[in-house]
């Protein structure tokens, strides 16, 4: 059972355990060609140097070939995500060869030993690929290695060792422990394939990071900042999933990378977009929703190859389950003045009304404090497609930054009982859609009434002349 020392307890224990005396087992890597979408079908086992299974099992030399590479295992069995991914690949690419790399005996070890085995497994995959290259019509460019956790680094080794260049490697939350900060030849890196794309879903800057934090591909995508995944909180996990411990929260977040990739295969009509940004905080502020100069990309299988980029960090928000797609909006709110604000920090809430649907009331996350007489940028996202935005309802509440400030507020109120109400003055809201890249300006419905008190609402409609307002003297900051 998990140790009480946080969600990473078991793995932390594994990292510091003395090496156990193990019985000698045959080091084995097997290649199972999944010949059916049916997860119960045993498939075909390919054998290096034996062409008969290729013919018997209908290996298509001219088609795409996917190699799925699992990670470290505590149970010694294939995890449940595996046949989901197999099935999704078969659904999307009907003629493709889907090969599961079975290195369970070498992965069902102490974590440190499994890490040491990744090189051997990578070498086995490279040898299999070298052999396949000897066949007519087989192209390494059609090979896509998909590695989860420790399997992502196995894929890196395979790409490094193979004669030639693999078409693509997708790293699904590559393992962090013993790889963070490692030399490029000892972990997944952009040199390992023509295109290396990576999804990071369990990274932590404190404690043990199960997934690697550093960028290791041509594009590195950090859904929800790469750390806390929606639907994986302890409450969600206890309530609705086949898990019941903090350890399973870790599993949920780590495995989310696989499900995001599966989603990109099966929900092709609902692609999720990620946006290039220097860090998660800037993304949360909403200043990174640009698609200019290849700054945005689809995630997962639909990602566009950007060979020229290296270690391009990209971010997005997602839903808690499939389809994961959300709709991102940048909101620029110019706060012209505070009135009697004291030490109170405002929290804004918006409701978006569109041609297709209306949003719920959405809080605007404050990354830094609200600036007066300045344009403040926020990120909001909706789970449904609202269509073209028509109007926005804005409210705000005062949220004290500390108990001390709350006390000061209360004291101030008691000493000045006739203190006039607190107000903010907001005349317009500028909105940019991440998905459509459309920019719109929304003006206060009543230009003479642009002050708003806590709990009251202010309505904004599309300004008649688009992005800029007439007679607007304050400078506008161009969207990135």
């Amino acid at each position: 059972s998990p140790t009480p020392f946080g969600p990473e307890g078991q793995l932390a224990d594994e990292l510091h355990k003395p090496k156990a005396i193990q019985t000698e087992v045959k080091p084995s890597v097997r290649f199972n060609l999944r010949t059916s979408k049916d997860p119960e079908h045993e498939g075909c086992y390919l054998s290096l140097g034996h062409s008969q299974p290729l013919e018997d099992c209908g290996f298509n030399m001219t088609a795409k070939t996917f190699f799925i590479i699992h990670g470290w295992t505590m149970s010694g069995i294939f995890e449940n995500w595996l046949h989901k991914l197999v099935s999704a690949l078969h659904t999307r690419e009907k003629d493709a060869n889907v090969v599961v790399v079975d290195w369970l005996p070498l992965a069902h070890q102490l974590y440190t030993d499994a890490v040491n085995n990744t090189r051997v497994v990578g070498h086995s995959i490279a040898r299999m690929l070298d052999w396949l290259q000897e066949k007519d019509d087989f192209s390494l460019g059609n090979v896509h290695l998909i590695g989860y956790s420790l399997g992502a680094h196995v894929a890196g080794y395979a790409g490094n060792f193979v004669k030639g260049t693999v078409g693509r490697i997708t790293g699904l939350d590559p393992a962090g422990p013993m790889f963070e900060g490692a030399d490029i030849h000892k972990r997944l890196s952009p040199d390992d394939a023509d295109f290396v794309d990576v999804l990071h879903t369990y990274t932590r800057s404190f404690g043990l990071s199960i997934g690697i934090q550093m960028p290791v591909g041509h594009i590195d995508i950090y859904p929800n900042g790469g750390d806390f995944q929606p639907g994986c909180g302890l409450n969600d996990v206890l309530g609705s999933m086949a898990y019941g411990t903090i350890t399973e929260v870790v599993k949920c977040e780590h495995e989310r990378a696989v499900h995001l990739f599966v989603d990109s295969l099966v929900n092709q009509d609902k692609p999720s977009f990620a946006f290039q940004c220097t860090d998660s905080n800037r993304f949360k502020k909403g200043i990174c929703l640009s698609c200019r100069k290849n700054r945005c990309n689809s995630i997962g299988y639909n990602a566009k190859k950007m060979r020229n980029k290296r270690n391009s960090k990209m971010y997005l928000k997602t839903r808690a389950g499939m389809p994961f797609r959300v709709y991102h909006y940048q909101m620029k709110i110019h706060v012209f003045s505070y009135k009697n604000m004291g030490e109170i920090e405002p929290t804004f809430y918006v409701t978006l009304y569109g041609t297709n649907a209306d949003s719920q009331t959405l809080p605007l996350e404050i990354v830094e404090r609200i600036e007066q007489n300045a344009t403040n940028t926020f990120l909001v996202y909706t789970e449904e497609d609202l269509g073209d935005l028509l109007k926005i309802q804005l409210t705000w509440e005062g949220a004290s930054q500390s108990w001390y400030n709350l006390w000061k507020e209360l004291r101030s109120y008691l000493s000045q009982p006739h203190n006039p109400g607190r107000e903010l003055n907001i005349r317009r809201i500028r909105v940019k859609s991440g998905e459509t890249q459309r920019k719109l300006t929304f003006c206060a419905e009543d230009p003479e009434n642009t002050s708003i008190s806590p709990g009251r609402e202010l309505w904004f409609r599309k300004c008649r002349d688009g992005w800029r307002m007439k007679n607007e003297t304050s400078p506008t900051v161009e969207l990135p």
């Epitope: 097997r30 086992y45 149970s75 294939f78 449940n80 005996p105 609705s240 999933m241 086949a242």
Partner: antibody
Framework: QVQLVQSGSELKKPGASVKVSCKAS????????MNWVRQAPGQGLEWMGW????????TYAGDFKGRFVFSLDTSVSTAYLQISSLKAEDTAVYYC?????????????WGKGTTVTVSS | DIVLTQSPASLAVSPGQRATITCKAS??????????MHWYQQKPGQPPKLLIY???NLASGVPARFSGSGSGTDFTLTINPVEANDTANYYC?????????FGGGTKVEIK
């Protein structure tokens, strides 16, 4: 057809050892894991563990660590269960059952069972 | 470990009637749209036989009188109509995680 043939009933004294065999036919032995399940008289089914028939790596359930050993002879497609230091409470029917490596891993083929009786 | 609780412990049914057995798991055995719950029949002196896999799929050679349903933590095995040779113990099993566990069994007798 696919079948698992187990060795015959055993009568043993406490402290002795027993080795039960399970011979597979009709399928590729190494393509499926082999489970061992115990059923004490009048009781339900209890999973003892399984062995990866390709690598030979065994996995034991909590109550079956120590005196119980799973092994293989892949040349004759046979799995073995050995129990040492037998106790009266080991009296049961022992079944081997195969499960796939992929998919939902249910037990689709069972041996007829081997009755092990431990009595002084 | 996931605990499976079967009810009733025993059941007496007349031929031609419906028999219903339920199995409740201590936590969900669903993974995405799949349920990792299976049902076995064990007749006296015989090994268990797979009846239903993944909650509702009929195993090869099993008559359509047997059906399974449910998701999450609650599952049902139905025999309709019951026949004389359905006298047996019936077990549910989960395989979403190791160790795979079995329910305590339901004894079905034909009146």
């Amino acid at each position: 057809q696919v079948q698992l043939v187990q060795s015959g009933s055993e009568l043993k004294k406490p402290g002795a050892s027993v080795k039960v065999s399970c011979k597979a036919s009709g399928y590729t032995f190494t393509n499926y894991g082999m489970n061992w399940v115990r059923q004490a008289p009048g009781q339900g089914l209890e999973w003892m563990g399984w062995i990866n028939t390709y690598s030979g790596v065994p996995t034991y359930a909590g109550d079956f660590k120590g005196r119980f050993v799973f092994s293989l002879d892949t040349s004759v497609s046979t799995a073995y269960l050995q129990i040492s230091s037998l106790k009266a409470e080991d009296t049961a029917v022992y079944y081997c059952a195969r499960r796939g490596y992929y998919g939902r891993r249910y037990f689709d083929v069972w041996g007829k069972g081997t009755t092990v009786t431990v009595s002084s | 470990d996931i605990v499976l609780t079967q009810s009733p412990a025993s059941l007496a049914v007349s031929p031609g009637q419906r028999a219903t057995i339920t199995c409740k798991a201590s936590q969900s055995v669903d993974y995405d749209v799949d349920s990792y719950m299976h049902w076995y029949q064990q007749k006296p002196g015989q090994p268990p036989k797979l009846l239903i896999y993944a909650a509702s799929n009929l195993a090869s050679g099993v008559p359509a009188r047997f059906s399974g349903s449910g998701s999450g933590t609650d599952f049902t095995l139905t025999i309709n109509p019951v026949e004389a040779n359905d006298t047996a113990n019936y077990y549910c099993q989960q395989t979403i995680e190791d160790p795979p566990t079995f329910g305590g069994g339901t004894k079905v007798e034909i009146k």
